[in-house]
């Protein structure tokens, strides 16, 4: 049978030929021609045998961690027979292992965060080595965990890798921790092999700092002709704490001004002092205000750090304008009569230097040449002024003060032209018609109307009558409808057109006014001859047809 | 009967690679039950084994010379050969080629051994 | 591998006499895989002994060997003019084949 011990080969030997052992059979004596032949992976290239003596050497380094086992097998011939001494069996070499790995850190780069003040005990980050040695191998994977880099702060739990916070820390002074850590195999026994790694500590802000001012007083300045919603100045708190937790509003003290107000810029964290109400430099030129300014967020088991908030006080200054001039009333409204002769009064404006010193002022009215203002304010007419062409005027009157011409003050003026009844009635249209030779008495030639330019504070009332000469005139009538329209109607039967082809009729037309006016106007009647059923045959003047009246071709 | 018959450079140039072949007569290397080896003997000296070949080129060498030898066979010329490589003064001896008798595993027969010298 | 030592390195003796060569193994060698050589000035080694106590083709009976595990020897039992000469134990039992320094018998 097979003669052999278990075999082993040290990894990473450097020798090239490194003896293993000996395979035998037990009826190999020396009196025999036997030869062993190795087989398997590795045969001829990692391990060779002597054939004639069985012994096996391993010629290449190995390395455990590549590959920690060999399967071979072997054979023994009697070269004598050419035949096979033993059966083919199979044998293992096992590669042992030699602490040639150090600790290796795979997770890194290692970042932790914690927040500052934590209590001592308070768990940051596990960090874990790996040694790619046999554990089982002796303590050549067997690790101990040390700290090279963050005391007092920091610990190490040495089987573990578990970091823990040793001392409290306060991020306002340092916010980040460079911690080494090392790993060594072997327990740490002398030989063994180690590794490290860099662990980042940052640690995050707690609300532990109140803001406070820089400055205990602040001096502002505003314009007096600055609206309101004006941003006259900020004021700066600074809170050593970063984030959420420096946030902060800004607020001033009660009952400490109704004319300021501080609004918090979130962005730059800034107070921006704000004009609530505008000011007057000659009312009061100078204010005084407390501020004062808490974090936006504190959790209840930080309030002890915010207990009392800071607070500064603000000056403000209001600056002297030269305000232009005043006005009495936003806008005026006059009314004056139509055809009032050049000269006449149409009304006062007035306005005021708001400043100390009360310069004269000068009016002016823009774009005008139907009014003139005094220096008094006083506006009268410099023509004479017609309704019906302009019933309003929209101006401008501006006020300028005498010392300083810059100052000006522009305000609406509007001037109703009343009317007066300057206008007489007179026919809405161009009337002209016809009768026909064997029109009946009584027969209605036209309906008219009339209309009147001027404006009539009650309804328009018209009065239609024929002139005098006319009345006298027999051929035709006129009826007043009493709304404003008449009709025209034959006064006889019959019509000759050619002893009078054409008649001119006069109606006289009067309003209602006070005093009343009246106009003439004239009516063109045709004579035609018709047929029977009326329609219009010949006429003098020319050809007309009867379609709504008459049309001019 | 067997003989063995050593062959080559008797000078040899530090670095370079010392040749040697045994040729054999009066039986086959081809006929097997024979490894055919190779010894050297420094100057007043003992012997030292550098290593085998058989017939079908299967080889084993010294561990300690492992790294530069090669022993190669020429069935067609019944010869072996040596070749060791990157040589240095400490190769300067005399190169015996050998018989290995398979069945007692000692070397029944010798050559008459030639001196190597390994100088500039 | 192992290591052979010969004693005593010089062994000086007449004609006649009776030599007694020791080889001593590092560790335990099969008595099959020892032999002993003899090599004369000038001279390539002759194998003289194998598997301890077996002659070679051709060699005297003068010349004998024993021992076994990690000690042997070889015996001339009568001292011929031409015995003298250094004689080497060798190894080959494991790998590598290795000699001991050898023995020189001188003629005294």
């Known amino acids: 049978g097979w003669v052999w011990n278990q075999f082993f080969v040290p990894e990473e030997m450097n020798t090239t030929s490194h003896h293993i052992g000996q395979l035998r059979s037990d009826l190999d004596n020396g009196n025999n021609s036997f030869q062993y032949k190795l087989l398997g992976a590795g045969a001829g290239s990692t391990f060779i045998i002597d054939e004639r003596t069985g012994d096996i050497y391993a010629i290449q380094k190995l390395d455990r961690e590549e590959r920690s086992l060999y399967i071979l097998r072997a054979q023994v011939i009697d070269i004598a027979t050419g035949r096979a001494v033993e059966p083919e069996s199979e044998f293992v070499i096992k590669v042992s292992d030699i602490n040639d790995n150090e600790p290796k850190f795979l997770d890194e780069p290692y970042e932790a965060i914690v927040p500052e003040m934590s209590p001592e005990g308070t768990l940051v980050i596990q960090v874990t080595a790996s040694d790619a040695d046999d554990p089982s191998s002796g303590n050549n994977a067997r690790l101990l965990y040390s700290l090279l880099q963050g005391q007092p702060y920091f610990s190490v739990e040495p089987t573990t890798g578990v970091i823990r916070i040793s001392s409290k820390m306060d991020r306002e002074l340092q916010d980040e921790y460079w911690v080494i850590i090392q790993a060594k195999d072997m327990i740490g026994q002398p030989g063994a092999l180690s590794g490290t790694t860099s662990v980042l500590i940052k640690l995050s802000d707690v609300n532990d700092n109140k803001p406070i001012f820089k400055e205990s007083l602040y001096r502002l300045t505003v314009s007096e002709s600055a609206p309101t919603g004006t941003s006259i100045g900020t004021i700066m708190a600074y809170d050593n704490d970063i984030g959420e937790n420096a946030e902060m509003d800004y607020s001033i003290e009660e009952d400490d001004s109704q004319t300021f107000d501080i609004i918090t810029n979130h962005e730059t964290q800034e107070g921006i002092v704000i004009l609530k109400k505008k000011v007057d430099f000659e009312h009061q030129n100078h204010y005084g205000i407390r501020a004062k300014v808490k974090n936006h967020h504190v959790p209840e088991q930080l309030m002890k750090y915010h207990t009392e908030a800071s607070t500064t006080f603000i000056k403000i200054q209001v600056e002297d304008v030269d305000e232009p001039p005043l006005f009495l009333l936003p806008y005026y409204v006059f009314e004056v009569f139509e055809e009032t002769p050049q000269g006449s009064f149409v009304g006062v404006v007035s306005a005021t230097d708001p400043d100390n010193r009360k310069s004269p002022i000068r009016y002016s009215i823009t774009r005008s040449k139907v009014f003139n203002i005094n220096d008094n304010g006083t506006i009268t007419t410099s023509n004479s002024l017609d309704r019906e062409i302009s019933a309003w005027y929209n101006l401008s009157i501006t006020a300028t003060e005498k010392y300083n011409i810059e100052q000006i003050s522009s305000i609406p003026l509007y001037v109703q032209v009343l009317n007066i009844n300057d206008h007489a009635p007179e026919f809405s249209q161009y009337y002209e018609t016809y009768v026909c030779e064997n029109a009946g008495s009584g027969q209605v030639i036209q309906t008219i109307s009339a209309v009147d330019r001027d404006e009539s504070i009650e309804e328009h009332h018209f009065y239609f009558n024929l002139s005098v000469e006319d009345t006298n005139n027999s051929s035709f009538t006129i009826i007043d409808n009493q709304d404003n329209t008449a009709v025209i109607l034959t006064n006889r039967t019959g019509f000759n057109l050619q002893e009078e082809p054409v008649f001119y009729i006069s109606i006289l037309i009067a309003d209602n006014g006070i005093p009343s006016l009246t106009s003439t106007n004239t009516l063109t009647i045709h004579v035609c001859d018709c047929g029977d059923s009326g329609s219009t045959q010949t006429c003098q003047y020319q050809e007309l047809v009867l379609s709504m009246g008459f049309k001019t071709e | 009967q067997v003989q063995l018959q050593e062959s080559g450079p008797g000078l040899v140039k530090p670095s370079q690679t010392l040749s040697l072949t045994c040729t054999v007569s009066g039986g086959s290397i081809s006929s097997g039950g024979y490894y055919w080896s190779w010894i050297r003997q420094h100057p007043g000296k003992g012997l030292e084994w550098i290593g085998y070949?058989?017939?079908?080129?299967?080889?084993f060498y010294n561990p300690s010379l492992r790294s530069r030898v090669t022993i190669s066979v020429d069935t067609s010329k019944n010869q072996f050969s040596l070749k060791l490589s990157s040589v240095t003064a400490a190769d300067t001896a005399v190169y015996y080629c050998?018989?290995?008798?398979?069945?007692?595993?000692?070397?029944?027969?010798w050559g008459q051994g030639t001196l190597v010298t390994v100088s500039s | 591998e192992i290591v052979l030592t010969q004693s005593p390195g010089t062994l000086s003796l007449s004609p006649g006499e009776r030599a007694t060569l020791s080889c001593r193994a590092s560790?335990?060698?099969?008595?099959?895989?020892l032999a002993w050589y003899q090599q004369k000035p000038g001279q390539a080694p002759r194998l003289l002994i194998y598997?301890?106590?077996s002659r070679a083709t051709g060699i005297p009976d003068r010349f004998s060997g024993s021992g076994s595990g990690t000690d042997f020897t070889l015996t001339i039992s009568r001292l011929e003019p031409e015995d003298f000469a250094v004689y080497y134990c060798?190894?080959?039992?494991?790998?590598?084949?290795?000699f001991g320094q050898g023995t020189k018998l001188e003629i005294k």
């Open positions: 560790q335990s060698v099969s008595s099959s895989y």
């Open positions: 050998a018989r290995d008798s398979s069945s007692s595993r000692a070397l029944d027969y």
């Open positions: 070949i058989y017939y079908s080129g299967s080889t």
């Open positions: 060798q190894q080959y039992d494991s790998s590598p084949r290795t």
């Open positions: 598997g301890a106590s």
